[in-house]
């Protein structure tokens, strides 16, 4: 796995332990919490990051994600089960044997059940809407400049191919970034839109996951773009299965 050779760190994930014990003495990094070897040339999967976050000391700063998400991430943080590739397992259970099914970004998509609950497949989240509100500025940002800057950010910082950034909408002070990535579109080596959205979310909250890199400094034509609120909505390839009782509550 590629990691910084000089001081053996993982540029894309600071929640790792690295040592020069890879093939030929190369630097190898393992995610905290799971011990899974990670590829430091790309984003680490959200499942491994969430697991690492839960393994961190309890007094560490951990902000629960907002609970207004569309496919609602009301459950906030939990210690997930990840498969050998670092993806969320379709079924997640807690220590009290309460289980539920999740999508590819780890958000619950069924009612909670017991150990008999079956989750046949990991359903892919193929459309993510990142809804931002920026702090007041002297005037509105130029839409095309804003669009170009956000596309540049996702391409350069998160290495997400621009074809997966479907649109950037802007009505001051609200910015919406639409990410779309069907199973058929995602080639080997492509960054997952869910992972890019998670890294972006942590960046805008000032909790960057990148090693040693400065925090996110978003500027549009030199004017700082400061985000004061983030909501993320997830749409799955197969609609979620919640009971009517929950939907009418």
């Amino acid at each position: 796995h590629t990691a910084a050779q000089d001081n053996c760190t993982c540029p894309t994930n600071k929640m790792t332990v690295c040592s020069p014990d890879g093939p030929g003495g190369r630097c190898q990094c393992r995610a905290l919490g799971s011990g899974v070897a990670v590829d430091c040339s790309t984003l680490t999967s959200e499942c491994l990051l969430l697991k690492a976050r839960m393994s961190a000391p309890k007094n560490a700063r951990t902000l629960v994600r907002p609970n207004e998400h569309a496919l609602v991430d009301n459950d906030g943080l939990y210690d997930p089960d990840c498969d050998p590739e670092g993806r969320f397992k379709a079924r997640q259970c807690n220590q009290t044997s309460v289980c539920w099914c999740v999508n590819s970004v780890g958000v619950r998509r069924t009612d909670k059940g017991d150990l008999s609950l079956r989750c046949d497949e990991l359903v892919r989240t193929h459309h993510i809407l990142i809804d931002l509100r920026h702090r007041p500025t002297a005037g509105a940002f130029n839409h095309s400049d804003l669009d170009a800057e956000l596309r540049r950010l996702f391409r350069e910082r998160y290495r997400l191919h621009p074809k997966f950034v479907a649109a950037v909408h802007y009505e001051q002070p609200t910015i919406q970034i639409e990410l779309r990535q069907n199973t058929s579109q995602k080639a080997a080596g492509d960054v997952d839109i869910g992972d890019a959205a998670y890294y972006f979310e942590r960046d805008v909250k000032g909790e960057s996951l990148f090693q040693g890199r400065g925090g996110l400094d978003l500027r549009v034509r030199g004017e700082p773009l400061q985000v004061e609120r983030t909501l993320i909505y997830y749409l799955d390839e197969i609609p979620p299965k919640f009971s009517m009782k929950r939907l009418t509550a």
């Epitope: 590629t2 540029p11 040339s41 391409r155 350069e156 191919h161 621009p162 074809k163 890199r213």
Partner: antibody, heavy 119, light 108 residues
Framework: QVQLQESGPGLVKPSGTLSLTCAVS?????????WSWVRQPPGKGLEWIGE???????NYNPSLKSRVTISVDKSKNQFSLKLNSVTAADTAVYYC????????????WGQGTLVTVSS | DIQMTQSPSTLSASVGDRVTITCRAS??????LAWYQQKPGKAPKLLIY???SLESGVPSRFRGSGSGTEFTLTISSLQPDDFATYYC??????????FGQGSRLEIK
């Protein structure tokens, strides 16, 4: 085997427009790749001009942005470069290249075509 | 722009020698670096990408290393075919993509 072939006038008058086309074979121009132009003045180093991804907006080197246009013709499996208001400083060998990755490194190149700007 | 600086600009060596070319970036580019070989009158040829990954068909005597701001291209045992100009290129940023000024490897 992927092959790229540049074509266009070898001589352009100052203040005129340089126009080149790159024909792609062995790969679809609509594939998951970037298509770039790179130039090399005689005896000098390489300079990236810009790129295009079919279905996306082109990106240009800021130093040339005001003068350059890159476009794609999917039906002919080719892409083109237009550079206007040329001067002698634009005399160079112009290469078209296929870019791999989210941001390009260049795995296939055309053989290059020398464009001289002179009256 | 990210500036790429190569050294030396010219180096003289003999067949069988081990040679090293260095490329420095003006800011950290992670491992997003490629190396090319160019012979007179020919297009550049990709040797190395992602700082250390050998392009298919390139002889194993070519080796790339480094990350962040400092990178090296090493040719372990020079062959007659290796005398050429070598360029590094960063692809951390596309605004713009930039190359080093080149390092000419000549026969001593």
């Amino acid at each position: 085997q992927v092959q790229l072939q540049e074509s266009g006038p070898g001589l352009v008058k100052p203040s005129g427009t340089l126009s080149l086309t790159c024909a792609v074979s062995g790969d679809s121009i609509s594939s998951n790749n970037w298509w770039s132009w790179v130039r090399q003045p005689p005896g000098k180093g390489l300079e990236w001009i810009g790129e295009i991804y079919p279905g996306g907006n082109p990106n240009y080197n800021p130093s040339l942005k005001s003068r350059v246009t890159i476009s794609v013709d999917k039906s002919k499996n080719q892409f083109s470069l237009k550079l206007n208001s040329v001067t002698a400083a634009d005399t160079a060998v112009y290469y078209c290249a296929r870019g791999s990755g989210v941001i390009s490194y260049f795995d296939y190149w055309g053989q290059g075509t020398l464009v001289t700007v002179s009256s | 722009d990210i500036q790429m600086t190569q050294s030396p600009s010219t180096l003289s060596a003999s067949v069988g020698d081990r040679v090293t070319i260095t490329c420095r970036a003006s800011q950290s580019i992670g491992h997003w670096l490629a190396w090319y070989q160019q012979k007179p009158g020919k297009a550049p040829k990709l040797l190395i990408y992602k700082a250390s990954s050998l392009e298919s068909g390139v002889p194993s005597r070519f080796r790339g290393s480094g990350s962040g701001t400092e990178f090296t291209l090493t040719i372990s045992s020079l062959q007659p075919d290796d005398f050429a100009t070598y360029y590094c290129q960063q692809y951390s940023s596309y605004s713009p993509i930039t190359f080093g000024q080149g390092s000419r490897l000549e026969i001593k």
